[in-house]
Every structure is written in structure tokens, then in C-alpha cells.
Interface confidence: medium
């Protein structure tokens, strides 16, 4: 199968980790989301309604 990270799917400089069932983005500080597409606002809020349970903004997500 093709490398799922080849298309550089992680936004804002996120690291892409390929694995057997897809990919994971580890977001740069200040970003969150499955593809690091959402900025974390300075007051700690984010562009998302809420981070998924158990995940902090910027944590790796599927």
C-alpha cells in the first residue's frame, strides 16, 4: 500500500506517523484536530467545540 503520509496530510507542521491502518498526526504546539487543522486559541479554548475525551489540545489523534 502507498504511504499514507506521502501527501503530507498533517497541517501546520504536524508530524505524520504512518501505520498499518492509516496515519496519526502529532500536532505542533498550538494546534489540534485529527489533521492538526484547528488552532488552539491563546485563552486555551479551541476552534472545536471540545477536545475528544482523554485528549489534550495538540495531542496525537487518529
Amino acid at each position: 500500500r502507498a504511504d499514507p503520509c506521502a501527501a503530507r496530510p498533517c497541517a501546520h507542521g504536524g508530524r505524520c506517523y504512518a501505520h498499518f491502518s492509516g496515519l496519526v498526526c502529532a500536532c505542533a504546539p498550538g494546534y489540534m484536530g485529527a489533521r492538526c487543522e484547528f488552532p488552539v486559541h491563546p485563552d486555551g479554548a479551541s476552534a472545536l467545540p471540545a477536545a475528544p475525551p482523554g485528549l489534550r489540545p495538540g495531542d496525537p489523534q487518529r
Partner: antibody, heavy 124, light 113 residues
């Protein structure tokens, strides 16, 4: 010149902790990590963990998680390894190595620069 | 965790002959495979990364190929200075190590016949 220099090796008592330091120079950190790899006498290479410097995140091998801590002191360009509850099986040469995480936007994950290694002997 | 298995464990080659070392991953690692050379008493040296890209200063008699789970390092014409132990190394996703993990093969010793 890109350089990594380990220090802190020597004799450690069983049950104690080893603490090593890796001094890095000659490169900017944004696309690199620093990894720790060890090699027991006459044995192969064993990856222990690494730190993604720009992101400030550490990643540890499953076999050593819970005993290991890698910490950065980026003001001094140094990276430390602490290994707790050591046994004679932890006797090894410990290397730090630069991990090329991203080169020209593409992930490579090769350890392209290595220190000279420092020998740790665990014995009473 | 991924297991990297190299073959053969040791290899005796005549000067000028070709040496081939194989490396097999226990799961798909795409092209995230590096090769290292280590000489006695020295630190390892990166030869090849991302399966086939030669590191800076590495002679072009070294080449790498493969993808997925099966990889090969070839030395087209072995020279005396190529004696040493060669290791493959993978980079892979591992939930057990917070998404980033490396693994080395057990090594292949190359000597001159």
C-alpha cells in the same frame, strides 16, 4: 560541525539510577530529535527513546517505559537520559543520536549523527 | 511491537564481490527503513535512509531497496573497509510508545573471505 557528546558514564549500583547527558551543537533543532540507543557488550543496538525537540514530546520504547526519562535543557543544548532501577543487564555503551525527523518537508527518521558513546557498568 | 529480522547473521565475501543483506519487518513499515554500518569500538554510521537514499558521503557501491516488510542492502563490490556489522532500523507507529518508535535488526556481520 554537527556534534553530539555524551557524558556521565561509569559505575552504577544495582537498584540505583543512571543519568547521562548529551550535548548537541552545530544544528538548529526544529526538524530534529535526539534519540538514545544502547549496546550491551558484544550485542546489537537497542533503541530506548527519543525527544522531538521542536514539539517537546518524548517517545519511549515499550520495554523501558516507566523506568526512563528523557529531558531537554534547550538553553544549554543538552538532553539527559535517566534510567531507574538498573540491573547488571543495563550494562552497555549508551549513545545519543540525532534523528532527522523531517528533511525538505518529507519524513525520514534516520539517525544521521551519533555521539561517541559512554560506557555504563552496573555492578556492586 | 515490530520485530526486525536480518539475514544472514554473518556473511563472508571476497573482495570485489557483491554482498546482500536482507531485513524483514513483522508488519508494514512502508519505506521508513534505514541502514547503518558499525565498526568495532565505533559508533554506528548512517548509510541509507528512507529505504534507498544514500546518506552524505556514502559511496555509491551501497544501495537499498524494498518496501512494506521486505528490504535489502547491497554492496556491489566489497572493499576491505566495508568490514563491520550492518543494522537495519525501522520507524513505525506504536500505540504502546505514544505513536513513534524505532526498532533495530539484530545485525549482520560482514567479513572478507
Amino acid at each position: 560541525e554537527v556534534q553530539l557528546v555524551e557524558s556521565g558514564g561509569g559505575l552504577v549500583q544495582p537498584g540505583g539510577s543512571l543519568r547521562l547527558s548529551c550535548a548537541a551543537s552545530g544544528f538548529t533543532f526544529s526538524n530534529y530529535g535526539v534519540s538514545w540507543v544502547r549496546q550491551a557488550p558484544g550485542q546489537g543496538l537497542e533503541w530506548m527513546g527519543y525527544i522531538d525537540i521542536a514539539f517537546g514530546r518524548t517517545y519511549y520504547a515499550s520495554w523501558v517505559t516507566g523506568r526512563i526519562t528523557i529531558n531537554p535543557d534547550t538553553s544549554k543544548n543538552q538532553f539527559s537520559l535517566q534510567l531507574n532501577s538498573v540491573t547488571p543487564e543495563d550494562t552497555a555503551v549508551y549513545y545519543c543520536a540525532r534523528v532527522a525527523l523531517v528533511v525538505a518537508g518529507v519524513a525520514y527518521y534516520g539517525m544521521d549523527v551519533w555521539g561517541q558513546g559512554t560506557l555504563v557498568t552496573v555492578s556492586s | 511491537d515490530i520485530v526486525m529480522t536480518q539475514s544472514p547473521d554473518s556473511l563472508a565475501v571476497s573482495l570485489g564481490e557483491r554482498a546482500t543483506i536482507n531485513c524483514q519487518a513483522s508488519q508494514n513499515i512502508y519505506s521508513y527503513l534505514s541502514w547503518y554500518q558499525q565498526k568495532p569500538g565505533k559508533a554506528p554510521k548512517l548509510l541509507i535512509y528512507r529505504t534507498s537514499t544514500l546518506a552524505s558521503g556514502v559511496p555509491d557501491r551501497f544501495s537499498g531497496s524494498g518496501s512494506g516488510t521486505d528490504f535489502t542492502l547491497k554492496i556491489s563490490r566489497v572493499e576491505a573497509e566495508d568490514v563491520g556489522v550492518y543494522y537495519c532500523q525501522s520507524y513505525y507507529y506504536s500505540s504502546g510508545s505514544s505513536y513513534g518508535a524505532f526498532a533495530f535488526g539484530q545485525g549482520t556481520k560482514v567479513e572478507i573471505k
